[in-house]
Every structure is written in structure tokens, then in C-alpha cells.
């Protein structure tokens, strides 16, 4: 039967290496045996270039294109093909798609006057342009209850954040996890990191009354 | 060492042909992009034709386009430039020039980073 | 199309002293911050041009120190200090931001 595309391409970028295109066929595909995205970017002799797309779903396809460090004025042409039979062509601008590096190695220590101090790395390096631009939100959660939870935004530039161990229950095991948004780049939010997990051993000051 | 030779320029009749050749050598032909630029006697340098390294993508000044073909033989590492319906005005020294890498997602850019020698294409009844 | 424009069309320069050529383009070749699409060429009586300077201000493999190219955006100039009588012939500026090509009209040195 016929090869369509039910929700066409959608791509972002996490403009150092990789741009990620993912989409959604009309019915159950192999995608790496189907289909294939080429691009090419706008700019004189470049080269096509062909991404083999993976299954994500049934349905849905996922392509990484390696992509050299991006530049604001970098244009993709993407063509999407099932054989010889092109079902989506289309242009794809990684500055105005950018979707930032997870943030890594987030750890948890405790520090002076009864605080927790969290650290983390910046998934980018000090020449990339998203080093100095990125802003983190960090989600505190308690395990044991879905309620108790806290969300902070983290706007300056270093990759830390201090917790008052006082703002979280006593005995209490938390875990946390950090994303990041490029602002100037109007970025979608990273994928969150893995969680970090610590009791918080706290003690209220009335239990020393 | 890289070495780019040129050859085929010879004297042909207005809305005659001819076919250029430059053969490559010191350096891996398919991975950059080569061009074309020619210049009249006396005159200045003029940009002809570019293709990339794999073939796959050709430019043409506006003065030979419809009448020049660029291509390559990257198994031969030589580029051709195909010349029909030639005119008094393509009279010129035509030189092949290595340009930019082209394996990588965006260009590696050097400039013109290699000349051959000429060759000499004169158009005249 | 982008037209390159080069001043002086021909420059007079004794041994020693400092060259300097100028080039203007009529659309930025900015690319990317520090990615100028202008590159300088020579070419001495009787030869095939030679590459000297390539985006804007980096030189070519095995070319002197004596030679500098810089500026960005649409306007770029080429300094050659402590003229050698070698380095007589036309310099020409070109742009490879996009298709087509294109050259200026050269700049002729002569070493007196």
C-alpha cells in the first residue's frame, strides 16, 4: 500500500553535534528498512547526506543527523523518502530549533549552616555559544509523597543551587533532577537528567528544645 | 605534492566544442569540490564552474551557463569541463583549482588552495 | 550577484615599505563570527594565480608573515609589509560565500 506521513517531521538541534528529527507514519513501519532522511545544507558544494531513522514506536521514527557545530546561519534542506517515492520535503534552521544538552553529573553534598549543596556540569563546552547562555530549572521531590515537591529556577551562570535543608521534611528521602534552556536561542527545555537520591537528616530546631 | 594539470585547450571555430580535462594528484580528489576560472587575454580572473566532491552538485556563471558542463571521474581524479556553442568571448587561459572540502555536513573552506598550470581555449573563425 | 571592488587598480611601493589593497563587497560575507568568505590571490607575470589569504585573515600554507589580510562584513584590506621586489604582480580579492564566484578587478603592484 501507499507510504504516508501522519505528523510530519519535527527537529531540533542541540547545536554543537546532533541534530534530531522525529515523526509519526500512518501505520506500523520499519523505519530503518523503509525510509530514509537525506539533507543537505544550503550553503556552496556541500554534500547530501543520509540519515537511516530508527523505530521509537510502532509508528514513530527518530533520525540523528551528525551535524558539525552549528552557526546561526546554518539551513538544512530535509527530504524524506520511502524508496524513490519523496512523502515530505521540508527546511530546518538548528538556531531557531535548539534543544539543549541534558545537564550531567548532577550530585548532592552537604554544606555549612545546614544546607545541601547541589552541583551539576554544563553539557557544553566553555567555546560553544550555549555554554554561557543556559538557565536551569531543578525539581525536588519527596519520595514518599507526590505532593511535596519544589521546583527552582536556577538564572545565574553557575551550575549549582543551595537548599536549605530547613524547607525540606526531616527523615525524608528526596531526589533530584536538573534541565536547562538556552533563553537567548527561545530553546525548548532539555530532557530532565537522571535523579540523584539523599535523606535529608535534618534535624527542626525544636527537637533540640 | 599537489598537482593539478590541464589539457584540451586548443583553437576551435565559433559554435565549436571542446572538452577540458584536469588530472589531480597528491591529494584524495573526491573529498573536495573543484573549479573552474578562466581569464581573457589581458584581463582579469573569472569565475567559470564549481562541483562539488562527490558530483552531485554543479554551478555555472551566468555568461556559460546552458553551454558549459562541469563534471568529474573521481575513480580517474580528473575534471572535465564540457564546452559547446563556444564564442569569440570564451577566448581565455582556463584554470582548474582545488576548493573547499566537501565530505564534511558544512564545507571546510580554504580558498582556491591549488592552481594548475592553464590552458589555452581560443575561439575565433 | 556579489560585486567585489578593489582600490587602488595600481599601487607603486618601494622595497621595505608597507603595501596596502583594499576590497569591498556589495553583500556581507560574514557567515558565522569569524567565517569571511573572502580570500586574496596573486598572480606574478606569466604565472597561475597563487592562494595567499582565505577567510578574510588566515594565510595560505607556506605564505610569508609579511602578508595580512583583514576586515569583516563588506570590507577587507590586504597589507604586504617590507615589499620584496618579488612580489610584483596582481593581487586580486574574491568572495566564496556563494554562487557565483566572483573576483575584483585586481590590483596591479609594482616595486619601484
Known amino acids: 500500500g501507499s507510504v504516508k506521513v501522519l505528523h510530519e517531521p519535527s527537529c531540533f538541534s542541540d547545536y554543537i553535534s546532533t541534530s534530531v528529527c522525529q515523526w509519526k507514519m500512518d501505520h506500523p513501519t520499519n523505519c530503518s528498512a523503509e525510509l530514509r532522511l537525506s539533507y543537505q545544507l544550503d550553503f556552496m558544494g556541500s554534500e547530501n547526506h543520509t540519515c537511516v531513522p530508527e523505530n521509537r514506536e510502532d509508528s514513530v521514527c527518530v533520525c540523528s543527523m551528525p551535524i558539525d557545530d552549528a552557526v546561526e546561519a546554518d539551513v538544512y534542506q530535509l527530504d524524506l523518502w520511502a524508496g524513490q517515492q519523496l512523502l515530505w520535503s521540508g527546511s530546518f534552521q538548528p538556531s531557531k530549533h535548539v534543544k539543549p544538552r541534558t545537564p550531567g553529573n548532577l550530585t548532592v553534598h552537604p554544606n555549612i549552616s545546614h544546607t545541601w549543596l547541589l552541583m551539576w556540569t554544563n553539557p557544553y563546552p566553555t567555546e560553544n555559544h550555549l555554554h554561557s547562555e543556559l538557565t536551569y530549572m531543578v525539581n525536588v521531590s519527596n519520595d514518599n509523597d507526590p505532593e511535596d515537591f519544589k521546583v527552582y529556577n536556577v538564572t545565574y551562570m553557575g551550575p549549582t543551587l543551595r537548599l536549605a535543608a530547613s524547607t525540606l521534611k526531616s527523615g525524608a528521602s528526596y531526589s533530584a533532577r536538573v534541565r536547562a534552556w538556552a533563553q537567548t536561542y527561545n530553546s525548548t527545555w532539555s530532557d530532565w537528567s537522571p535523579s540523584t537520591t539523599w535523606l535529608n537528616y535534618y534535624e527542626p530546631w525544636e527537637q533540640h528544645l | 605534492e599537489v598537482q593539478l594539470v590541464e589539457s584540451g585547450g586548443d583553437l576551435v571555430k565559433p559554435g565549436g566544442s571542446l572538452r577540458l580535462s584536469c588530472v589531480a594528484s597528491?591529494?584524495?580528489?573526491?573529498?573536495?569540490?573543484m573549479t573552474w576560472v578562466r581569464q581573457a587575454p589581458g584581463k582579469g580572473l573569472q569565475w567559470v564552474s564549481l562541483i562539488n566532491g562527490s558530483g552531485g552538485k554543479t554551478y555555472y556563471a551566468d555568461a556559460v551557463k546552458g553551454r558549459f558542463t562541469i563534471s568529474r571521474d573521481n575513480a580517474k581524479n580528473t575534471l572535465y569541463l564540457q564546452m559547446n556553442s563556444l564564442r569569440a568571448e570564451d577566448t581565455a587561459v582556463y584554470y582548474c583549482a582545488v576548493d573547499r572540502l566537501t565530505k564534511t555536513v558544512r564545507p571546510q573552506y580554504y580558498g582556491l588552495w591549488s592552481w594548475g598550470q592553464g590552458t589555452l581555449v581560443t575561439v575565433s573563425s | 550577484d556579489i560585486v567585489m571592488t578593489q582600490t587602488p587598480l595600481s599601487l607603486s611601493v618601494s622595497p621595505g615599505e608597507t603595501a596596502s589593497i583594499s576590497c569591498r563587497s556589495s553583500?556581507?560575507?560574514?557567515?558565522?563570527?569569524?567565517?569571511?568568505?573572502l580570500d586574496w590571490y596573486l598572480q606574478k607575470p606569466g604565472q597561475s594565480p597563487q592562494g595567499l589569504i582565505y577567510l578574510g585573515s588566515k594565510r595560505a600554507s607556506g605564505v610569508p608573515d609579511r602578508f595580512s589580510g583583514s576586515g569583516s562584513g563588506t570590507d577587507f584590506t590586504l597589507r604586504i609589509s617590507r615589499v620584496e621586489a618579488n612580489d610584483t604582480g596582481v593581487y586580486y580579492c574574491?568572495?566564496?560565500?556563494?554562487?557565483?564566484?566572483?573576483f575584483g578587478q585586481g590590483t596591479k603592484l609594482e616595486i619601484k
Open positions: 553583500q556581507s560575507l560574514l557567515y558565522s563570527i569569524g567565517y569571511n568568505y
Open positions: 597528491g591529494f584524495t580528489f573526491r573529498d573536495y569540490a
Open positions: 574574491m568572495q566564496g560565500l556563494q554562487s557565483p564566484l566572483t
